[in-house]
Interface confidence: low
């Protein structure tokens, strides 16, 4: 069937359109184009005779049309009036006619639109704004963009006038955005330049910074005010209701207590005509004095005196704090605080209570510290120590003894020999000693402040012959695999060699044996029962030698796992059952028996005469060593057979 296709269907003014013919019959005489939906000679555009290839313009020919041999019609430089239907009339050789109609629409190229507004400075929460997209164009579609996004859904946004007008009701500061409109028709689309909506708002309630409301006398007060506002707000400051200045910042140097009060910032927007204020209360505090500590006793005596430390000055509504050794106060029954924390009392002072002590005054802004105070605790003297610790000397050497006793103030020392005062010095020196210098050497330490004295006595023996040594032990009954034992060879003598023997032999090499203190001390680690031997120490110098009496180490051990004898477990009825239990243990263990879990007797031997099958069961021997605190046990099953029924042994 003969058809007409318009390419394109929608044509922009000034462009061209091709009316393309499909299914054109063969054996044609010619064809003719008409404007409209029917063949009308008055509206003929152009005719074409195939035989002569001659085109003849008709009454509707505009000079913009071109006809092609395939009957297609090109119309150039399209105008609005070209919109409509076009009919092709085909004359076949047999003079039978055929018709087809096509159409196209002509649209103008749209101009770049612009936005007009009915209110260039709308006020927030008060005004509405109507944007209109210009110009008004027929057959055009209108679109709107906010910040290059399509319109959000909002009850405050309304489109009208064929979408040509966008109305924003009750504008807010958030409506301050870029607005664009767009016009579209089938042949073109144009977007306007952006229009920025300038919403007048504020001022909001101003904020005053910094938030700090407490100041010290002598500081600078520098307050800044800010309120969200368009256009920017104008600021005024009032102090206690009195106008000060029209600035955003308020600066008062070197403030005093008199500057305390209410500070008001007023923000004004000249365009909206609105005012908003914020008030802050500023408190200026007088600078407190630096605290200091007083004491009721500057030289307390250890274990006798109490000391009360008071934080000065006394200030009402003030918190007092204390520190000892730069730490907060430890919990101690010897430390007491008064109700207001101003007085710290140390009951029964010790030498460790020297401090330093600090007190602090806490006010609204800070904590002020006192200077540290150190207590002068009087103590001692403790028992003096005399060094060196030697008690035996050879004739001809120098004797030099030194005495020391912990004391505050430092002790005064005196030396006595056999009760006779010698000298008031800390050191005693005697050159080229003889046997006559043997005796009791006493050091006396005296604390002049406390009036206390302490003495220590040392026996000095001057002899060419060494004395018979003895062995002292730190543990007379060590427990096996648990305790260590330290043997010390007495006395301590100058220029002396110490030797040890075990069971008459020199010391074996063992990681459990250690010599120390110039070989004077022999330590046995983790003792075993095999260490229960005879230990002898010896001392020797260039002129003599001597050995101690032996000391036997009594090692507590066990009880080991007990053994029940005889080993038999099968018996004949009528025999006597005689079980003996033994466990290696020092001291000997306590024994007890249980038969089938029932306690029996506390003996080493269990005897039952004329047993019967009723005596079948488990026989348990329990052993315990009260010295080591250890226990052990063993269980034996006994079977008693009726006479003649099974082989067995009789006891």
């Amino acid at each position: 069937k003969l058809t007409i296709e318009s390419t394109p269907f929608n044509v922009a003014e000034g462009k061209e359109v091709l009316l393309l013919v499909h299914n054109l019959p063969q054996h044609l005489f010619g064809y003719s184009w008409y404007k409209g939906e029917r063949v009308d000679g008055n509206r003929q555009i152009i005719g074409y005779v195939i035989g002569t290839q001659q085109a003849t313009p008709g009454p509707a020919y505009s000079g913009r049309e071109i006809i092609y041999p395939n009957a297609s019609l090109l119309i150039q430089n399209i105008i609005q009036n070209d919109t409509g239907f076009y009919t092709l009339h085909v004359i076949k050789s047999d003079l039978v006619n055929e018709e087809a109609t096509g159409q196209f629409r002509v649209y103008p190229e749209l101009p770049k639109p612009s936005i007009s507004s009915n209110n260039s400075k709308p006020v927030e929460d008060k005004d509405a704004v109507a944007f209109t997209c210009e110009p008004e164009t027929q057959d055009a579609t209108y679109l709107w963009w906010v910040n290059n996004q399509s319109l959000p859904v909002s009850p405050r946004l309304q489109l009208s006038n064929g979408n040509r007008t966008l109305t924003l009701f009750n504008v807010t500061r958030n409506d301050t955005a870029s607005y664009k409109c767009e016009t579209q028709n089938p042949v073109s689309a144009r977007r306007s330049d952006s229009v920025i909506l300038n919403v007048l708002y504020g001022p909001d309630a101003p904020t005053i910074s910094p938030l700090n409301t407490s100041y010290r006398s002598g500081e600078n007060l520098n307050l800044s005010c800010h309120a969200a506002s368009n256009p920017p707000a104008q600021y005024s400051w009032f102090v206690n209701g009195t106008f000060q200045q029209s600035t955003q910042e308020l600066f008062i140097p070197n403030i005093t207590v008199n500057n305390s009060g209410s500070y008001t910032c007023q923000a004004h927007n000249s365009d909206t005509g609105l005012n908003r204020t914020t008030v802050t209360t500023i408190t200026v505090y007088a600078e407190p004095p630096k605290p200091f500590i007083t004491s009721n006793n500057s030289n307390p005596v250890e274990d006798e005196d109490a000391v009360a430390l008071t934080c000065e000055p006394e200030i009402q509504n003030t918190t007092y704090l204390w520190w000892v050794n730069n730490q907060s106060l430890p919990v101690s029954p010897r430390l007491q605080l008064s109700n207001d924390n101003r007085t710290l009392t140390l009951l029964s002072v010790t030498r460790n209570d020297v401090g330093p002590y600090e007190c602090g005054i806490q006010n609204e802004l800070s904590v002020d510290h006192s200077d540290p105070v150190i207590l002068n605790v009087l103590y001692g003297p403790d028992d003096p120590t005399i060094s060196p610790s030697y008690t035996y000397y050879r004739p001809g050497v120098n004797l030099s003894l030194s005495c020391h006793a912990a004391s505050n103030p430092p002790a005064q020392y005196s030396w006595l020999i056999d009760g006779n005062i010698q000298q008031h010095t800390q050191e005693l020196f005697i050159s080229n000693i003889t046997e006559k210098n043997s005796g009791l050497y006493t050091c006396q330490a005296n604390n002049s402040a406390s009036g206390h004295s302490r003495t220590t006595v040392k026996t000095i023996t001057v002899s060419a012959e060494l004395p018979k040594p003895s062995i002292s032990s730190n543990n007379s009954k060590p427990v096996e695999d648990k305790d260590a034992v330290a043997f010390t060879c007495e006395p301590e003598a100058q220029n002396t060699t110490y030797l040890w023997w075990v069971n008459g032999q020199s010391l074996p090499v063992s990681p459990r044996l250690q010599l120390s203190n110039g070989n004077r001390t022999l330590t046995l680690f983790n003792v075993t029962r095999n260490d229960a031997r005879a230990y002898v120490c010896g001392i020797q110098n260039s002129v003599s030698a001597n050995r101690s009496d032996p000391v036997t180490l009594d090692v507590l051990y066990g009880p080991d796992t007990p053994i029940i004898s005889p080993p038999d477990s099968s018996y004949l009825s009528g025999a006597n059952l005689n079980l003996s239990c033994h466990s290696a243990s020092n001291p000997s263990p306590q024994y007890s028996w249980r038969i089938n879990g029932i306690p029996q007797q506390h003996t080493q031997v269990l005897f039952i005469a004329k047993i019967t099958p009723n005596n079948n069961g488990t026989y348990a021997c329990f052993v315990s060593n009260l010295a080591t605190g250890r226990n052990n046990s063993i269980v034996k099953s006994i079977t008693v057979s009726a006479s003649g029924t099974s082989p067995g042994l009789s006891a």
């Epitope: 700090n212 407490s214 100041y215 010290r216 002598g218 500081e219 600078e287 704090l321 520190w323 730069n326 730490q327 907060s328 602090g360 806490q362 802004l365 800070s366 904590v367 510290h369």
Partner: nanobody, 120 residues
Framework: EVQLVESGGGLVQAGGSLTLSCTSS????????MGWYRQTPGKQRDLVAD?????????NYAGFAQGRFTISRDNIKNTVYLQMNDLKPEDTAVYYC????????????WGQGTQVTVSS
């Protein structure tokens, strides 16, 4: 003598973050209102933020620090912190911590401070 040690400063780009720490081996912070201060060359030290003694329930900030900086304290660790977000070139300064909230001149001893440099 009180010794305060600030740390955590450094070079950071605008918009970045830093956390400053302050501790002392000679001063127990718990009973003190503690503050962070900053100083640029030729200017006085300015209070940045402060935190109340004990549990630190009350915090105050200078206008420029509001919303960007956070002060906190850990009494167990005897440490005060200043978390600084969205740093700006104008935040470049030496930052100090101390007792004494507002009366800057009265603090007994200042630490070495920690340098914060914000590059654009």
């Amino acid at each position: 003598e009180v010794q305060l040690v600030e740390s955590g400063g450094g070079l950071v780009q605008a918009g970045g973050s830093l956390t400053l720490s302050c501790t002392s081996s000679t001063l127990t912070f718990t009973p003190y209102r503690m503050g962070w201060y900053r100083q640029t060359p030729g200017k006085q030290r300015d209070l940045v933020a402060d935190i109340s003694p004990g549990d630190g329930s009350t915090k105050n900030y200078a206008g420029f620090a509001q919303g960007r900086f956070t002060i906190s304290r850990d009494n167990i660790k005897n440490t005060v912190y200043l978390q600084m977000n969205d740093l700006k070139p104008e935040d470049t300064a030496v930052y100090y911590c101390n007792t004494y909230v507002a009366f800057v001149g009265r603090a007994r001893t200042w630490g070495q401070g920690t340098q914060v440099t914000v590059s654009s």
